[in-house]
């Protein structure tokens, strides 16, 4: 059986986009399918479609095709953002140049070379002819557009509206003439989609017929759109994998632009004394490799033959025998003059980052414009323009697009904790970047700390030394178990999320942990009916310096009479001094015959300055901390309580205002406790809950 050709490479893909018809007269056809490839094959062959298919949308969620007789350039149509949609437009209908003789040209040029308007194909005035649309199905003899239905030498043509001139060719340029590149085309982002021998390019997001490593999601900055020629690996010029199973790849015929200047955005930062990034812009005169062996001249083929010549690699400054990085290697290098050592790296050239100190941001980093593009977990950031829908989901204003260039760490949502980025990794959809606040920067990230401007309450409801047993509504209290023993407290803030402390996790093996909910006794005695035991599927540590951890449960807790969630305060809110609060916990109680029951200790909120005085001035509290003192001498949180909540009530609503963390001693008389201030991290908590995927119940 003849293998059906895969035609998806004939389409331009616009991810997360659909077309909406404003004109109700426009037709549309839909059908359930499995893949976008199936949609493409049917669109190309027009099989079973009552119109000429110019574009289609693949609905990934419903596994459905929507075929259109129009595209994004048609009138009566508008583009719309849609997470589950991918728009594919037949390139022939949007191309403004021709390939070869232009047989496949389906653009909208309708004027001849000398400027005469074309005669419509369906008309016999002023010229009678046999080129009827019905006789040339698939040749798109629409309107009065220039076409070459028989593939004749001169390229697309038309009958003219001038009775004196029967037909004339149209002046449509060859795509290879329109497309041009600078240097070796590393920054080329044009639409050439066939090789110099005319082979059609394979889509970068496909692995057939050739498997390859250049996945668009892995290299977001390389411009791997559709099946266009690119130069991701420092070759002499752009290339692509081909659809010919016997030709893995081939160069593309893209001429050098007449005005051979590079855009500012394409030029690597030129340095002469040190290496910035991978050193593509190094233009210094170091000419030995790291161990002192001299470099071979780039224009010489002795002792090593090579194609890294100044002619092949224009704009790479391959002068003399200086260390350079023309091919995107790890750092500048050269061929060596030692016949036994072909190449060597010049790693003795210092890194610019080391000589100019570290990247840092001021305030909350909303104006950070550095070029770091990886997260604190080492993930490469994904391009901002691919994540705009997700961004819109958690901000209510239009982000400043001019700042969201490439995939650099930025802070478009006014996050209090600094620059971040999306990753493209489903386990870690976004994360902070490893950039700290500039030393000495005192710009507050929350204003009005000491003025109760923002109320903390939104809606409704600690190992505690000398605390009294409690059984009232504490269904949000979690016992975090480590290797089957209670190690810490925690608060259930959402069915799948527990708020706790960094110090509670001695191991990174999630199988070591369990969350017990609905219990009153630390050993679960007598709680069998109400106890829920849940595994842990992920830990998300808080922003730099926070001591908080959000613990994702492997399945959602079932909310009932014994298990409930507790509310979070409003971001940046302040709670009035002397507000009565409580800490809860199963930790060390000061009693020899500890009964293992959950205890509560009553505290009251104390202002940061007063709190510092109680700590004899040895402690300065910042905006991320909250202080509460005991009504009863020597009661308060201790070991085993860490991670548990400081719960306060405002307007008859109970909420978790603090998290117990180690550091200030156990329930010391006249020493108020210092807790992590949850209000300072409320936006971070909401952002994680909103964006990190959780299992469905």
């Amino acid at each position: 059986q003849r293998k059906r050709r895969n035609t998806i490479h004939e389409f331009k893909k616009s991810a997360k986009t659909t077309l909406i018809k404003i004109d109700p007269a426009l037709k549309i056809k839909t059908k359930k399918v499995n893949t976008a490839d199936q949609c493409a094959n049917r669109c190309t062959r027009n099989k079973g479609l009552p119109f000429t298919c110019k574009a289609f949308v693949f609905d990934k969620a419903r596994k459905q095709c929507l075929w259109f007789p129009f595209n994004s350039m048609s009138s009566g149509v508008k583009k719309e953002f849609g997470h589950e949609f991918d728009l594919y437009e037949n390139k022939d209908y949007i191309r403004n140049c021709i390939i070869g003789k232009g047989r496949s040209y389906k653009g909208t040029v309708s004027i001849t070379k000398s400027g005469i308007k074309c005669q419509p194909w369906s008309s016999m005035i002023p010229h009678e002819h046999s080129f009827l649309p019905s006789s040339y199905r698939g040749k798109d003899l629409q309107e009065n557009y220039c076409r070459n239905p028989r593939g004749e030498e001169g390229g697309p043509w038309c009958f003219t509206s001038n009775p004196e001139v029967r037909y004339e060719v149209c002046d449509i340029p060859q795509c290879s003439e329109v497309e041009c590149m600078t240097c070796n085309g590393e920054s080329y982002r044009g639409l050439m989609d066939h090789t110099e021998s005319g082979k059609i390019c394979q889509r970068w997001d496909h692995q057939t017929p050739h498997r390859h490593k250049f996945l668009p999601e892995r290299y977001p900055d390389k411009g791997f759109d559709d099946n266009y020629c690119r130069n991701p690996d420092g070759q002499p010029r752009p290339w692509c994998y081909t659809l010919d199973p016997h030709t893995r790849w081939e160069y593309c015929a893209i001429k050098t632009c007449a005005d051979n200047t590079m855009n500012d955005t394409d030029v690597p930062l030129e340095t002469t004394e040190c290496i910035q990034g991978q050193g593509e812009g190094y233009r210094g005169t170091v000419n030995t490799i790291w161990n002192g062996i001299p470099c071979q001249r780039w224009d010489s083929q002795y002792p090593h033959e090579h194609d890294m010549t100044p002619e092949n690699f224009k704009c790479k400054d391959l002068r003399e025998n200086y260390c350079r990085n023309p091919d995107g290697s790890e750092s500048p290098w050269c061929f060596t003059t030692d016949p036994n050592i072909r190449v060597g790296y010049c790693s003795q050239i210092p890194n610019c980052d080391m000589s100019h100190g570290q990247d840092c941001y001021r305030g909350n980093g909303k104006n950070y414009m550095g070029n770091l593009s990886q997260t604190r977990s080492g993930l490469t950031c994904s391009m901002w323009d691919k994540n705009m829908e997700d961004l819109h989901r958690h901000i209510f204003w239009e982000p400043d697009a001019s700042k969201l260039n490439e995939n650099y760490c930025r802070n478009p949502d006014d996050d209090a904790h600094g620059p971040w980025c999306y990753t493209g990794n489903p386990l870690i959809p976004w994360d902070y970047c490893p950039i700290s606040r500039c030393e000495g920067d005192t710009t507050p990230t929350i204003v009005n700390l000491d003025h109760p401007v923002i109320s903390c309450a939104k809606t409704k409801q600690l190992r505690v030394v000398n605390g009294i047993p409690t059984r009232t509504n504490i269904g949000w209290m979690v016992s975090l178990r480590y290797r089957n023993k209670h190690i810490c407290g925690g608060s259930l803030i959402k069915e799948s999320w527990v708020l706790t402390a960094r110090q509670c996790f001695p191991s990174r093996d999630l199988k070591d942990y369990e969350a017990w909910l609905g219990i009153h006794d630390v050993h679960g005695r007598g709680d069998e009916k109400c106890k829920q035991v849940l595994n842990v599927s992920q830990l998300v540590y808080g922003p730099e310096g926070s001591d908080l951890v959000l613990m994702k449960l492997a399945r959602p807790a079932v909310l009932d009479d014994f298990v409930s969630t507790i509310d979070l305060p409003n971001y940046g809110c302040t709670i009035p001094e002397k507000t009565s609060c409580s800490v809860y916990g199963w930790g060390y109680t000061g009693l020899i015959n500890y009964d293992g029951l959950l205890r509560v200790a009553h505290l009251y909120i104390m202002g940061n300055e007063k709190c510092s005085q109680h700590h004899r001035g040895k402690v300065t509290l910042n905006e991320s901390e909250i202080c509460a003192g005991a009504e009863k001498i020597g009661s308060g949180p201790c070991e085993g309580d860490y991670g548990g909540p400081l719960v306060c009530e405002q307007h008859k609503m109970r909420m978790v205002l603090g998290v117990i963390v180690p550091g200030r001693g156990c329930a010391i008389p006249n020493r108020p406790g210092i807790f992590v201030r949850v209000a300072y991290y409320a936006k971070w908590i909401h952002k994680i809950i909103l964006t990190y995927k959780v299992p469905q119940s």
Epitope: R218, D353, G357, Q358, D359, L372, Q374, R376, S377, G378, L379, T380, T423, G424, N425, L427, I428, D431, Y432, C433, P434, I435, S436, E439, R502, Q503, F505, S507, R508, L510, S537, Q538, L539, V540, Y541, G542, E544, G545
Partner: antibody, heavy 118, light 108 residues
Framework: VEESGGRLVTPGTPLTLTCTVS????????MSWVRQAPGEGLEWIGA??????TYYTNWAKGRFTISKTSSTTVDLKITSPTTEDTATYFC????????????????WGQGTLVTVSS | QVLTQTPPSVSAVVGGTVTINCQSS???????LSWYQQKPGQTPKPLIY???SLASGVPSRFKGSGSGTQFTLTISDLECDDAASYYC??????????FGGGTEVVVK
């Protein structure tokens, strides 16, 4: 975590070491290579992160190449070994997608010895 | 990024206390400084992560403290089994790690 491929090589002969993990998936774990010359301290060479992005310390750029070759293996290539590269090479986990924002080396292999001598 | 560990070697008696310092030439991101113990012929074992958090199975005699560029490991109630080399490691912007030069602890 288990390293392999260490052996005696002559200067200039490229050598590839392999780190094989079991019970963890390299698509959610970032692995680092650390070396220790005889009687000396630990030196971080570089890493292959959760998504396969590679990072190197300054002195290692160009001299070493790290690549994630599958969901269970990550390689370290010593491009042109010199006698100074004689050391035990360790593979260790630095990052884990299950625990976001806690970077340290908690799982270590036993190491593989590389001797460079003419 | 340079981590300087001092002293290179220290000796103390059983039951005593040892303090090892680790100073960074640049600020360590988020205080992600960790401490490791290595005995001859063995693989390094994590003791402390994030400057002060105790790793799995590590007795509370080991205490980490510090922030920014200055960090300390304190071992109290010293035992014979604590004789080993100790290394600090820091994490920097740009996803770069660095180890300190090591401190040899001798227990008498």
């Amino acid at each position: 975590v288990e390293e392999s491929g260490g052996r005696l090589v002559t200067p200039g002969t490229p050598l590839t070491l392999t780190c094989t993990v079991s019970g963890i998936d390299l698509n959610s774990n970032g692995m680092s290579w650390v070396r220790q010359a005889p009687g000396e301290g630990l030196e971080w060479i570089g890493a292959s992160s959760i998504d396969g992005t590679t990072y190197y310390t300054n002195w290692a750029k160009g001299r070493f190449t790290i690549s994630k070759t599958s969901s269970t293996t990550v390689d370290l290539k010593i491009t042109s070994p010199t006698t100074e590269d004689t050391a035990t090479y360790f593979c260790t986990r630095g990052e884990y997608a299950g625990v976001v924002g806690s970077n340290y080396f908690d799982l270590w292999g036993q190491g593989t010895l590389v001797t460079v001598s003419s | 990024q340079v981590l300087t560990q001092t002293p290179p070697s220290v000796s103390a008696v059983v039951g005593g206390t040892v303090t090892i310092n680790c100073q960074s030439s640049q600020r360590i991101y988020s205080n992600w400084l960790s401490w490791y113990q290595q005995k001859p012929g063995q693989t390094p074992k994590p003791l402390i992560y994030a400057a002060s958090s105790l790793a799995s199975g590590v007795p509370s005699r080991f205490k980490g403290s510090g922030s920014g560029t200055q960090f300390t490991l304190t071992i109290s109630d010293l035992e014979c089994d604590d004789a080993a080399s100790y290394y600090c490691a820091g994490y920097y912007s740009g996803h770069i790690y660095s180890f300190g030069g090591g401190t040899e602890v001798v227990v008498k």
